[in-house]
Interface confidence: medium
Protein backbone atom coordinates (compact mmCIF):
# COMPACT_ATOMS: atom_id res chain seq x y z
CA UNK A 1 0.00 0.00 0.00
CA UNK A 2 1.27 3.48 -0.84
CA UNK A 3 0.40 6.46 1.32
CA UNK A 4 0.30 9.96 -0.13
CA UNK A 5 0.14 13.28 1.68
CA UNK A 6 0.53 16.92 0.69
CA UNK A 7 4.19 17.91 0.46
CA UNK A 8 3.34 21.52 1.28
CA UNK A 9 2.55 22.43 4.87
CA UNK A 10 -1.11 22.85 5.74
CA UNK A 11 -1.59 26.41 7.01
CA UNK A 12 -4.44 26.77 9.49
CA UNK A 13 -5.69 29.85 11.28
CA UNK A 14 -6.11 29.62 15.04
CA UNK A 15 -9.70 28.63 16.00
CA UNK A 16 -10.52 27.31 12.52
CA UNK A 17 -10.67 23.67 11.38
CA UNK A 18 -7.88 22.06 9.36
CA UNK A 19 -7.76 18.97 7.18
CA UNK A 20 -4.55 16.95 7.06
CA UNK A 21 -4.84 15.08 3.80
CA UNK A 22 -3.73 11.47 3.54
CA UNK A 23 -4.74 8.92 0.93
CA UNK A 24 -4.01 5.35 -0.09
CA UNK A 25 -5.02 3.21 -3.07
CA UNK A 26 -7.27 0.33 -1.96
CA UNK A 27 -7.07 -2.96 -3.86
CA UNK A 28 -10.23 -4.36 -5.45
CA UNK A 29 -12.34 -6.09 -2.81
CA UNK A 30 -10.86 -4.00 -0.01
CA UNK A 31 -12.98 -3.79 3.13
CA UNK A 32 -12.58 -1.58 6.20
CA UNK A 33 -12.13 -4.69 8.35
CA UNK A 34 -8.66 -4.99 6.79
CA UNK A 35 -7.65 -1.41 7.55
CA UNK A 36 -5.41 -0.23 10.32
CA UNK A 37 -5.06 3.55 10.23
CA UNK A 38 -3.08 5.51 12.80
CA UNK A 39 -2.40 9.23 12.99
CA UNK A 40 0.31 10.25 15.42
CA UNK A 41 2.56 13.20 16.22
CA UNK A 42 5.76 12.59 14.27
CA UNK A 43 8.21 13.77 16.92
CA UNK A 44 6.71 12.35 20.10
CA UNK A 45 4.83 9.40 18.59
CA UNK A 46 1.76 10.47 20.60
CA UNK A 47 -1.40 8.84 19.24
CA UNK A 48 -3.82 11.34 17.71
CA UNK A 49 -6.56 9.20 16.10
CA UNK A 50 -6.96 5.61 14.94
CA UNK A 51 -9.18 3.28 12.96
CA UNK A 52 -8.60 -0.40 13.75
CA UNK A 53 -10.53 -3.65 13.88
CA UNK A 54 -13.11 -2.28 11.47
CA UNK A 55 -14.10 0.73 13.52
CA UNK A 56 -13.16 4.27 14.37
CA UNK A 57 -11.38 4.20 17.73
CA UNK A 58 -11.90 7.91 18.13
CA UNK A 59 -9.72 10.81 19.07
CA UNK A 60 -6.83 10.33 21.46
CA UNK A 61 -5.95 14.01 21.16
CA UNK A 62 -8.14 16.42 23.10
CA UNK A 63 -11.33 15.19 21.37
CA UNK A 64 -10.86 17.57 18.47
CA UNK A 65 -10.05 15.12 15.67
CA UNK A 66 -12.23 13.19 13.26
CA UNK A 67 -11.81 10.98 10.22
CA UNK A 68 -14.05 11.00 7.14
CA UNK A 69 -15.74 7.61 7.72
CA UNK A 70 -17.76 7.56 4.48
CA UNK A 71 -14.60 8.17 2.44
CA UNK A 72 -12.27 5.65 4.09
CA UNK A 73 -13.32 2.80 1.83
CA UNK A 74 -12.30 4.96 -1.16
CA UNK A 75 -8.81 5.40 0.31
CA UNK A 76 -9.28 8.79 1.96
CA UNK A 77 -7.56 8.62 5.35
CA UNK A 78 -7.54 12.38 5.96
CA UNK A 79 -7.77 13.79 9.47
CA UNK A 80 -9.94 16.73 10.48
CA UNK A 81 -8.56 18.83 13.33
CA UNK A 82 -11.11 21.17 14.87
CA UNK A 83 -10.58 24.56 16.53
CA UNK A 84 -6.86 24.64 15.81
CA UNK A 85 -4.57 25.86 18.59
CA UNK A 86 -0.98 27.08 18.55
CA UNK A 87 0.06 23.91 20.36
CA UNK A 88 -1.25 21.78 17.45
CA UNK A 89 1.53 23.01 15.20
CA UNK A 90 4.00 20.40 14.00
CA UNK A 91 4.31 17.24 11.96
CA UNK A 92 1.67 14.49 11.86
CA UNK A 93 2.30 10.99 10.49
CA UNK A 94 -0.37 8.96 8.73
CA UNK A 95 0.23 5.17 9.03
CA UNK A 96 -1.84 2.88 6.83
CA UNK A 97 -1.63 -0.90 7.15
CA UNK A 98 -3.67 -3.35 5.10
CA UNK A 99 -1.49 -6.33 4.23
CA UNK A 100 1.69 -4.35 4.13
CA UNK A 101 2.06 -0.82 5.48
CA UNK A 102 3.27 2.62 4.52
CA UNK A 103 3.42 6.00 6.20
CA UNK A 104 3.97 9.65 5.36
CA UNK A 105 4.16 12.88 7.34
CA UNK A 106 2.31 16.13 6.80
CA UNK A 107 3.21 19.43 8.45
CA UNK A 108 0.64 21.69 10.10
CA UNK A 109 1.58 25.36 10.26
CA UNK A 110 -0.55 27.43 12.61
CA UNK A 111 -1.03 31.14 12.08
CA UNK A 112 -3.02 34.06 13.42
CA UNK A 113 -3.17 37.50 11.80
CA UNK A 114 -1.91 40.53 13.70
CA UNK A 115 -4.25 43.40 14.50
CA UNK A 116 -3.83 46.82 12.88
CA UNK A 117 -1.04 48.49 14.85
CA UNK A 118 -1.87 51.22 17.31
CA UNK A 119 0.65 54.05 17.52
CA UNK A 120 1.53 56.08 20.61
CA UNK A 121 3.91 58.98 21.02
CA UNK A 122 5.85 60.09 24.09
CA UNK A 123 5.90 62.99 24.72
CA UNK A 124 2.74 63.76 22.80
CA UNK A 125 2.58 67.54 23.05
CA UNK A 126 4.80 70.60 22.79
CA UNK A 127 6.92 68.84 20.20
CA UNK A 128 9.70 70.76 18.47
CA UNK A 129 12.17 69.83 15.74
CA UNK A 130 15.23 68.35 17.40
CA UNK A 131 13.22 66.79 20.22
CA UNK A 132 13.82 63.10 20.95
CA UNK A 133 10.50 61.21 20.81
CA UNK A 134 9.54 57.64 21.48
CA UNK A 135 7.04 56.12 19.04
CA UNK A 136 5.49 52.81 20.06
CA UNK A 137 3.79 50.49 17.56
CA UNK A 138 1.62 47.79 19.17
CA UNK A 139 -0.11 44.91 17.43
CA UNK A 140 -1.88 42.01 19.09
CA UNK A 141 -2.88 38.36 19.05
CA UNK A 142 -0.77 37.08 16.16
CA UNK A 143 1.20 33.92 15.51
CA UNK A 144 4.02 33.21 14.90
CA UNK A 145 6.21 36.09 16.05
CA UNK A 146 6.07 39.09 13.76
CA UNK A 147 8.75 40.77 11.74
CA UNK A 148 8.66 44.52 12.42
CA UNK A 149 9.88 47.19 10.02
CA UNK A 150 10.03 50.97 10.50
CA UNK A 151 10.19 53.52 7.68
CA UNK A 152 10.17 57.28 7.40
CA UNK A 153 7.87 59.30 5.14
CA UNK A 154 10.16 58.72 2.14
CA UNK A 155 10.09 54.97 2.66
CA UNK A 156 13.64 54.85 3.99
CA UNK A 157 14.11 52.04 6.55
CA UNK A 158 14.73 53.16 10.13
CA UNK A 159 16.86 50.50 11.81
CA UNK A 160 18.74 52.53 14.39
CA UNK A 161 17.19 52.92 17.79
CA UNK A 162 14.53 50.20 17.70
CA UNK A 163 13.62 47.73 20.44
CA UNK A 164 10.92 45.12 20.05
CA UNK A 165 9.08 42.98 22.59
CA UNK A 166 7.07 39.91 21.59
CA UNK A 167 5.28 38.17 24.41
CA UNK A 168 3.02 35.14 24.27
CA UNK A 169 -0.28 35.00 26.12
CA UNK A 170 -1.82 31.88 27.64
CA UNK A 171 -3.06 30.75 24.20
CA UNK A 172 0.41 31.13 22.70
CA UNK A 173 -0.54 34.18 20.62
CA UNK A 174 1.91 37.06 20.53
CA UNK A 175 1.54 40.73 21.29
CA UNK A 176 4.24 42.83 19.65
CA UNK A 177 5.40 46.21 20.90
CA UNK A 178 8.09 47.93 18.87
CA UNK A 179 9.63 51.17 20.08
CA UNK A 180 11.42 53.67 17.83
CA UNK A 181 13.39 56.51 19.38
CA UNK A 182 13.95 59.26 16.87
CA UNK A 183 14.94 62.91 16.69
CA UNK A 184 12.10 64.90 15.12
CA UNK A 185 12.62 66.73 11.87
CA UNK A 186 10.53 69.78 10.88
CA UNK A 187 7.73 67.39 10.04
CA UNK A 188 7.58 63.75 9.20
CA UNK A 189 5.73 60.49 8.94
CA UNK A 190 6.86 57.38 10.78
CA UNK A 191 5.41 54.06 9.67
CA UNK A 192 5.50 50.68 11.32
CA UNK A 193 4.83 47.46 9.41
CA UNK A 194 4.06 44.27 11.33
CA UNK A 195 4.45 41.23 9.08
CA UNK A 196 3.21 37.72 9.77
CA UNK A 197 5.89 35.54 8.12
CA UNK A 198 3.56 32.58 7.58
CA UNK A 199 0.54 34.43 6.21
CA UNK A 200 2.67 37.08 4.49
CA UNK A 201 0.14 39.47 6.01
CA UNK A 202 1.24 43.05 6.59
CA UNK A 203 -0.43 45.29 9.15
CA UNK A 204 0.44 48.97 8.87
CA UNK A 205 0.39 51.84 11.32
CA UNK A 206 1.76 55.35 10.98
CA UNK A 207 2.01 58.66 12.78
CA UNK A 208 2.50 62.02 11.07
CA UNK A 209 4.04 64.86 13.00
CA UNK A 210 3.37 68.29 11.46
CA UNK A 211 3.60 70.58 14.45
CA UNK A 212 0.15 70.27 16.05
CA UNK A 213 -2.10 68.36 15.95
CA UNK A 214 -0.73 64.85 15.48
CA UNK A 215 -2.26 62.53 12.91
CA UNK A 216 -2.48 58.78 13.52
Amino acid sequence: VEVQVSEDPVVALVDTDATLRCSFSPEPGFSLAQLNLIWQLTDTKQLVHSFTEGRDQGSAYSNRTALFPDLLVQGNASLRLQRVRVTDEGSYTCFVSIQDFDSAAVSLQVAAPYSKPSMTLEPNKDLRPGNMVTITCSSYQGYPEAEVFWKDGQGVPLTGNVTTSQMANERGLFDVHSVLRVVLGANGTYSCLVRNPVLQQDAHGSVTITGQPLTF
Epitope: V86, P144, S165
Partner: antibody
Protein backbone atom coordinates in the same frame (compact mmCIF):
# COMPACT_ATOMS: atom_id res chain seq x y z
CA UNK B 1 16.06 15.95 23.84
CA UNK B 2 16.87 17.92 20.69
CA UNK B 3 20.53 18.03 19.65
CA UNK B 4 22.19 20.95 17.85
CA UNK B 5 25.58 20.76 16.14
CA UNK B 6 27.43 23.70 14.57
CA UNK B 7 29.70 23.26 11.56
CA UNK B 8 31.78 25.50 9.33
CA UNK B 9 35.29 26.85 8.89
CA UNK B 10 37.24 27.73 12.01
CA UNK B 11 39.30 30.38 10.24
CA UNK B 12 37.99 33.27 8.13
CA UNK B 13 40.00 36.07 6.55
CA UNK B 14 39.18 39.72 7.36
CA UNK B 15 36.56 41.32 5.04
CA UNK B 16 35.28 37.88 4.01
CA UNK B 17 31.99 36.20 4.98
CA UNK B 18 31.65 33.89 7.95
CA UNK B 19 29.27 30.99 7.18
CA UNK B 20 28.07 28.48 9.75
CA UNK B 21 25.42 25.77 9.72
CA UNK B 22 23.52 24.24 12.62
CA UNK B 23 22.14 20.73 12.16
CA UNK B 24 19.20 19.74 14.36
CA UNK B 25 18.58 16.12 15.31
CA UNK B 26 16.13 14.28 17.56
CA UNK B 27 13.52 16.88 16.76
CA UNK B 28 12.08 18.65 13.75
CA UNK B 29 13.01 22.24 12.95
CA UNK B 30 9.46 22.52 11.60
CA UNK B 31 7.89 21.86 14.99
CA UNK B 32 6.12 25.05 15.89
CA UNK B 33 6.77 27.33 18.80
CA UNK B 34 10.57 27.36 18.54
CA UNK B 35 12.90 29.97 17.12
CA UNK B 36 16.30 28.83 15.89
CA UNK B 37 19.00 31.13 17.15
CA UNK B 38 22.62 32.16 16.96
CA UNK B 39 24.54 33.52 19.96
CA UNK B 40 28.25 34.27 20.19
CA UNK B 41 30.83 34.59 22.93
CA UNK B 42 34.02 36.56 22.46
CA UNK B 43 37.11 34.91 24.03
CA UNK B 44 36.91 35.17 27.80
CA UNK B 45 33.81 37.37 27.57
CA UNK B 46 30.04 37.21 27.95
CA UNK B 47 27.25 36.13 25.60
CA UNK B 48 25.85 38.17 22.71
CA UNK B 49 22.59 37.40 20.92
CA UNK B 50 22.90 37.58 17.11
CA UNK B 51 19.44 36.66 15.85
CA UNK B 52 17.01 33.86 15.12
CA UNK B 53 14.69 32.44 12.50
CA UNK B 54 11.32 30.70 12.50
CA UNK B 55 10.96 27.63 10.30
CA UNK B 56 8.64 29.50 7.96
CA UNK B 57 11.39 32.05 7.31
CA UNK B 58 10.68 34.98 9.61
CA UNK B 59 13.94 36.49 10.86
CA UNK B 60 14.88 38.64 13.83
CA UNK B 61 18.33 40.23 14.17
CA UNK B 62 20.28 42.16 16.76
CA UNK B 63 20.28 45.84 15.70
CA UNK B 64 24.04 46.08 16.17
CA UNK B 65 24.67 43.30 13.62
CA UNK B 66 21.60 43.61 11.41
CA UNK B 67 23.41 45.18 8.44
CA UNK B 68 25.85 42.24 8.22
CA UNK B 69 23.79 39.22 9.29
CA UNK B 70 21.63 36.78 7.35
CA UNK B 71 20.04 33.71 8.97
CA UNK B 72 18.35 31.16 6.72
CA UNK B 73 16.63 27.81 7.22
CA UNK B 74 16.45 24.58 5.22
CA UNK B 75 13.66 22.47 6.68
CA UNK B 76 14.34 19.60 4.27
CA UNK B 77 17.81 19.16 5.82
CA UNK B 78 16.70 20.15 9.33
CA UNK B 79 19.35 22.88 9.31
CA UNK B 80 19.64 26.62 9.76
CA UNK B 81 22.59 28.81 8.84
CA UNK B 82 24.36 32.04 9.74
CA UNK B 83 26.16 34.37 7.37
CA UNK B 84 28.11 37.34 8.72
CA UNK B 85 29.67 39.60 6.10
CA UNK B 86 32.70 41.92 6.19
CA UNK B 87 34.20 40.26 9.24
CA UNK B 88 36.98 41.76 11.32
CA UNK B 89 39.07 40.47 14.22
CA UNK B 90 36.29 41.70 16.51
CA UNK B 91 34.09 38.90 15.14
CA UNK B 92 36.45 36.24 16.51
CA UNK B 93 34.26 34.27 18.93
CA UNK B 94 32.70 30.95 19.81
CA UNK B 95 29.43 30.79 17.88
CA UNK B 96 26.56 28.81 19.39
CA UNK B 97 23.32 27.75 17.79
CA UNK B 98 20.43 27.41 20.20
CA UNK B 99 16.71 26.79 20.30
CA UNK B 100 14.53 29.53 21.75
CA UNK B 101 11.13 28.59 23.17
CA UNK B 102 8.56 31.16 22.09
CA UNK B 103 6.33 30.80 25.12
CA UNK B 104 9.08 31.58 27.62
CA UNK B 105 11.60 33.45 25.43
CA UNK B 106 14.28 31.09 26.82
CA UNK B 107 17.18 29.35 25.08
CA UNK B 108 16.40 25.82 26.21
CA UNK B 109 18.87 23.83 24.04
CA UNK B 110 22.36 24.80 22.88
CA UNK B 111 24.95 23.42 20.48
CA UNK B 112 28.48 22.71 21.69
CA UNK B 113 29.80 25.85 19.98
CA UNK B 114 32.38 26.43 17.26
CA UNK B 115 35.37 28.75 17.56
CA UNK B 116 35.73 31.02 14.55
CA UNK B 117 38.94 33.04 14.29
CA UNK B 118 39.16 36.01 11.94
CA UNK B 119 42.77 36.38 10.85
CA UNK B 120 44.79 36.78 7.68
CA UNK C 1 18.72 48.04 25.10
CA UNK C 2 18.14 46.48 28.51
CA UNK C 3 21.30 46.26 30.62
CA UNK C 4 21.69 43.46 33.17
CA UNK C 5 24.22 43.90 35.97
CA UNK C 6 25.32 40.88 37.98
CA UNK C 7 27.02 40.78 41.35
CA UNK C 8 29.35 39.52 42.58
CA UNK C 9 31.49 38.84 39.52
CA UNK C 10 33.43 36.20 41.45
CA UNK C 11 32.00 33.94 44.13
CA UNK C 12 34.23 31.51 46.08
CA UNK C 13 32.07 29.04 48.03
CA UNK C 14 32.74 26.13 50.35
CA UNK C 15 31.00 22.89 49.29
CA UNK C 16 27.77 22.38 51.23
CA UNK C 17 27.40 26.13 51.86
CA UNK C 18 24.71 28.30 50.18
CA UNK C 19 25.44 30.75 47.39
CA UNK C 20 23.53 33.72 46.06
CA UNK C 21 23.93 35.70 42.82
CA UNK C 22 22.18 38.98 42.11
CA UNK C 23 21.02 40.31 38.73
CA UNK C 24 19.70 43.85 38.36
CA UNK C 25 17.91 45.04 35.22
CA UNK C 26 17.88 48.58 33.86
CA UNK C 27 14.10 48.26 33.41
CA UNK C 28 11.30 46.07 34.66
CA UNK C 29 11.14 42.60 33.11
CA UNK C 30 7.51 42.08 34.17
CA UNK C 31 5.14 41.96 31.20
CA UNK C 32 1.39 42.61 31.30
CA UNK C 33 0.68 38.86 31.01
CA UNK C 34 2.08 38.49 34.53
CA UNK C 35 5.29 36.74 33.49
CA UNK C 36 8.79 37.97 34.29
CA UNK C 37 11.15 37.36 31.38
CA UNK C 38 14.37 36.60 33.24
CA UNK C 39 16.37 33.38 32.80
CA UNK C 40 19.48 31.93 34.42
CA UNK C 41 22.11 29.86 32.59
CA UNK C 42 25.22 28.02 33.78
CA UNK C 43 28.29 27.65 31.62
CA UNK C 44 30.55 24.96 33.03
CA UNK C 45 34.26 25.10 32.12
CA UNK C 46 34.80 24.17 28.46
CA UNK C 47 31.07 23.66 27.83
CA UNK C 48 28.20 25.53 26.24
CA UNK C 49 25.67 27.29 28.47
CA UNK C 50 22.92 25.16 29.98
CA UNK C 51 19.42 26.24 30.84
CA UNK C 52 18.66 26.51 34.58
CA UNK C 53 15.72 28.82 35.34
CA UNK C 54 13.07 30.43 33.13
CA UNK C 55 10.42 33.10 33.66
CA UNK C 56 12.10 34.19 36.87
CA UNK C 57 11.69 31.16 39.07
CA UNK C 58 10.78 28.01 37.07
CA UNK C 59 13.43 25.28 37.09
CA UNK C 60 14.22 23.77 33.69
CA UNK C 61 13.79 20.02 33.26
CA UNK C 62 16.44 18.02 35.11
CA UNK C 63 17.74 20.93 37.18
CA UNK C 64 18.30 19.94 40.84
CA UNK C 65 15.98 21.55 43.37
CA UNK C 66 18.92 23.12 45.19
CA UNK C 67 18.72 25.83 42.49
CA UNK C 68 16.01 28.45 42.89
CA UNK C 69 15.22 31.75 41.23
CA UNK C 70 13.39 34.66 42.83
CA UNK C 71 12.79 38.37 42.43
CA UNK C 72 10.50 40.65 40.50
CA UNK C 73 10.57 43.82 38.43
CA UNK C 74 14.24 44.75 38.23
CA UNK C 75 15.95 42.76 41.00
CA UNK C 76 16.52 39.02 40.76
CA UNK C 77 18.43 36.39 42.67
CA UNK C 78 19.69 32.90 41.92
CA UNK C 79 20.21 30.83 45.04
CA UNK C 80 22.00 27.51 45.44
CA UNK C 81 21.01 26.01 48.78
CA UNK C 82 24.07 23.73 49.11
CA UNK C 83 26.86 24.15 46.59
CA UNK C 84 28.37 21.01 45.08
CA UNK C 85 31.65 20.66 43.20
CA UNK C 86 29.76 20.17 39.91
CA UNK C 87 28.15 23.62 40.25
CA UNK C 88 31.35 25.47 39.33
CA UNK C 89 31.23 27.67 36.25
CA UNK C 90 29.95 31.03 35.11
CA UNK C 91 26.31 31.92 35.80
CA UNK C 92 24.52 34.31 33.45
CA UNK C 93 21.16 36.01 33.77
CA UNK C 94 19.35 36.88 30.52
CA UNK C 95 16.34 39.01 29.70
CA UNK C 96 13.90 37.73 27.09
CA UNK C 97 11.50 40.66 27.27
CA UNK C 98 12.89 42.78 24.49
CA UNK C 99 15.14 42.50 21.48
CA UNK C 100 18.06 42.69 21.49
CA UNK C 101 18.08 39.95 24.10
CA UNK C 102 20.85 40.67 26.56
CA UNK C 103 22.88 38.75 29.13
CA UNK C 104 24.51 39.80 32.36
CA UNK C 105 28.29 39.88 32.39
CA UNK C 106 28.48 36.60 34.31
CA UNK C 107 29.34 35.47 37.84
CA UNK C 108 32.16 32.95 38.24
CA UNK C 109 31.42 30.45 41.01
CA UNK C 110 34.46 28.57 42.27
CA UNK C 111 35.08 26.15 45.10
CA UNK C 112 37.17 27.40 48.04
Amino acid sequence: QVQLVESGPGLVKPSQTLSLTCTVSDGSISSGGYYWSWIRQHPGKGLEWIGYIYYSGGTYYSPSLKSRVTISVDTSKNQFSLKLTSVTAADTAVYYCARRAGYSSSFDSWGQGILVTVSS
Amino acid sequence: EIVLTQSPLSLPVTPGEPASISCRSSQSLLYSNGYTYLDWYLQKPGQSPQFLIYLGFNRASGVPDRFSGSGSGTDFTLKISRVEAEDVGVYYCMQGLQTPYTFGQGTKLEIK
